[in-house]
């Protein structure tokens, strides 16, 4: 059986947590880490469409960030492969009502955590 914890949503062998609270990007990742998870890593268009549909109209942080002049990277250190456009000039990415955008890390938003569902 798949083991998505209470309050997490299962989709394609992953579990997602959509916050009600708001935090900055760093604090959002710390929350996810406490749950043995990361800010969401989006691996397919189906996954992106699911997240956009499920999160509603609010902005939600995801696990993409960049240092000045550097490429976007996921939390796990892998480089972003331009699966979707990211608007804006910030260093951290979030999903809005149209797709992905970016903002400064200290701004507060809702967030999405993701982890693999652990089959037992």
């Amino acid at each position: 059986q798949a083991a998505c914890p209470e309050s997490w949503i299962g989709f394609q062998r992953k579990c997602f947590y959509f916050s009600d609270d708001t935090k900055n990007w760093t604090s959002s990742q710390r929350f996810c880490d406490s749950q043995d998870a990361d800010l969401a890593q989006v691996e397919s268009f189906q996954e992106l469409n699911f997240l956009l549909r499920y999160k509603g109209p609010s902005d939600h942080w995801i696990g993409l960030s960049r240092e000045q002049g550097q490429p976007w990277k996921w939390i796990n250190g892998t480089e972003w492969t331009r699966q979707f456009p990211i608007l804006g000039a910030g260093e951290c990415a979030y999903l809005n009502d149209k797709g992905a955008s970016s903002a400064r890390h200290y701004t507060e938003r809702k967030w999405i955590c993701s982890k693999s569902d652990i089959h037992v």
């Epitope: 083991a3 914890p5 710390r30 929350f31 880490d33 406490s34 749950q35 043995d36 998870a37 990361d38 890593q41 939390i75 796990n76 250190g77 982890k115 693999s116 569902d117 652990i118 089959h119 037992v120």
Partner: antibody
Framework: EVQLVQSGGGLVEPGGSLRLSCAAS????????MSWVRQAPGKGLEWVGR??????????DYAAPVQGRFTISRDDSKNTLYLQMDSLKTEDTAVYYC???????WGQGTLVTVSS | EIVLTQSPGTLSLSPGERATLSCRAS???????LAWYQQKPGQAPRLLIY???NRATGIPARFSGSGSGTEFTLTISSLQPDDFATYYC?????????FGQGTKVDIK
Amino acid sequence: EVQLVQSGGGLVEPGGSLRLSCAASRFTFSDAWMSWVRQAPGKGLEWVGRIKSKISGGTTDYAAPVQGRFTISRDDSKNTLYLQMDSLKTEDTAVYYCANRNLGYWGQGTLVTVSS
Amino acid sequence: EIVLTQSPGTLSLSPGERATLSCRASQSVSSSYLAWYQQKPGQAPRLLIYDASNRATGIPARFSGSGSGTEFTLTISSLQPDDFATYYCQQYNSYSRTFGQGTKVDIK
């Protein structure tokens, strides 16, 4: 039923090394973040460190007393977690447990005694 | 490093009584980052409560967790013979995940 079966404990002299193993079965080990926790005789629990899943980068974090001496690794092809302990001290004497915090799974524990 | 202090060190009660165990943090811990474990002699710990108030799978309803900030409580509403054990709180607010020193619940 989920199992975490530990091995590799024993008696070692101060300054010596030991490697503990934790073999996982009946869950998707490769997706799990795993931890080591220890308990000195008659004392409380002490977190040793943890390793993330490969998809989360496979990174490790350690408690201050073991940083630089202990190394956590994993072999997902063998469903096995490891704790390499080097430069062992008498105060490292404890029962060592492997665990998956998120699901509440724990190994049976293995005793490591550091003594001359 | 966040230090967790549990009190009392030992709690002597009779079966059927209510047990209230305290866990105080040296700095604020989000309620999402605190767990409680039960341990019996010679056994591995057992997860009781995660995220301060959520019961783990298979844990009876007599166990409940509450609190926020720096003060957290584990309550056992009516002690059963099987509940006499040592209880630990653990925080996972920081990347070093510390435990309290434990509270032993023994039979009066």
